[in-house]
């Protein structure tokens, strides 16, 4: 098993990249002198205890920043948040930490990231630029849930 995170870059089908702004991830068109975040990802070591055929369960973090993506309910609404967390602390836990886990599915070059804690909710960006990443259960409407993930080796 790989027990160090892999690094990657992400953009959506509109060629927007993820950038960190005031502890929030937003999707913006790529420009010069811009520094998109590098993603850190690692597969859950307890894959056998999670649902099969839903994708590869991964923890998603921001490389070198000790920040990880997690899903939590605010009121009745699942929301996407950044939490200060070492991705390896999550990886080493004795059980899957579902609030920080996403099922990563690939179809061709497109990747989706479905919340393990809230099945049917996906990481998404609004079709308008400069908006924070969100969770949505409405696929292919006002929000984009398909991303291009390029691994950095």
């Amino acid at each position: 098993k790989i027990d160090t995170p892999q690094r990657g870059s992400i953009q959506d089908i509109n060629h927007r990249v993820w950038v960190l702004q005031d502890q929030t991830l937003i999707a913006v068109p790529r420009k010069d002198r811009m520094s998109p975040v590098t993603i850190a990802l690692i597969s859950c070591r307890h894959v056998e205890t999670l649902e099969k055929d839903r994708g590869n369960p991964i923890y998603l973090g921001l490389n070198g920043l000790n920040l990880c993506l997690m899903c939590a309910k605010v009121g009745d609404q699942p929301t996407l948040q950044l939490k200060e967390k070492d991705i390896m602390d999550l990886y080493n836990q004795p059980e899957p930490v579902k609030s920080f886990l996403f099922y990563h599915s690939q179809s061709g070059r497109n990747s989706t990231f479905e919340s393990v804690a809230f099945p049917g909710w996906f990481i998404a960006v609004s079709s308008e630029g400069g908006c924070p990443l969100i969770l949505t259960q409405e696929l292919g409407k006002a929000n984009t849930t398909d991303f291009g993930l390029t691994m950095l080796f």
Partner: antibody, heavy 121, light 109 residues
Framework: EVQLQQSGAELVKPGASVRLSCTAS????????IHWVKQRPEQGLEWIGR????????RYDPKFQGKATITTDTSSDTVHLQFSSLTSEDTAVYYC??????????????WGQGTTLTVSS | QAVVTQESALTTSPGEAVTLTCRSS?????????ANWVQEKPDHLFAGLIG???DRAPGVPARFSGSLIGDKAALTITGAQTEDEAIYFC?????????FGGGTKLTVL
């Protein structure tokens, strides 16, 4: 208030099967893992196994694999422990416990009151 | 499979500090064993105290602390109180299963 309420005491004959229950209240059972633990007099605690109630996946101590079966009924927020081919060695108090992630770690934070199982002819 | 060993009984006085330990037959206890400590009071009343070696569960008094001492996990009660009289169990994680110790009966008198 978080609570785990267990079913009442059982007296069963050797060779029979039994199903114990643990009903959760005050929290969403799908957000945690529910474990079963055995306690015999003067013998400490033995971990039996656990279930993820959200998806039904289980883990067992090798010693209890094939002997114990943990299932869940999320519609009633209840987790069951089924034992087959009972012997006097299975006479014990059985506890369900919640393993919950909080802050940075998992905790066996809340426990049921225990169910006494007596296997005797 | 590992055997987890605890002191069978300890006695302390109110206001004193006492340390309970938890040893594994398979070698040194490390943070990767995610030591948990639970308290059992009369009438089968269990409550979690410590998780992840040294994290206190919500609502647990600050006098309870978890640590590693040498090759063992440890629970220290600083300024023991009479209501701390109980049996204390540790649980250690081993890759895919938990193992509980035999428990330490703590008397406070």
């Amino acid at each position: 208030e978080v609570q785990l309420q267990q079913s009442g005491a059982e007296l069963v004959k050797p060779g029979a099967s039994v199903r114990l229950s643990c009903t959760a209240s005050g929290f969403n059972i799908k957000d945690t893992y529910i474990h079963w633990v055995k306690q015999r007099p003067e013998q400490g605690l033995e971990w039996i196994g656990r279930i993820d109630p959200a998806i039904g996946t289980t883990r067992y101590d090798p010693k209890f694999q094939g002997k114990a079966t943990i299932t869940t009924d999320t519609s009633s927020d209840t987790v069951h422990l089924q034992f087959s081919s009972l012997t006097s060695e299975d006479t014990a108090v059985y506890y369900c416990a919640r393993l919950h992630y909080f802050g940075n770690n998992f905790f066996f934070d809340y426990w049921g009151q225990g169910t006494t199982l007596t296997v005797s002819s | 499979q590992a055997v987890v060993t605890q002191e069978s009984a300890l006695t302390t006085s109110p206001g004193e500090a006492v340390t309970l330990t938890c040893r594994s037959s398979s070698g040194a206890v490390t943070t990767s064993n995610y030591a948990n400590w639970v308290q059992e009071k009369p009438d089968h009343l269990f409550a979690g105290l410590i998780g992840g070696t040294n994290d206190r569960a919500p609502g647990v008094p600050a006098r309870f602390s978890g640590s590693l001492i040498g090759d063992k996990a440890a629970l220290t009660i600083t300024g023991a109180q009479t209501e701390d009289e109980a049996i204390y169990f540790c649980a250690l994680w081993f890759s895919n299963h938990w193992v509980f110790g035999g428990g330490t009966k703590l008397t406070v008198l």
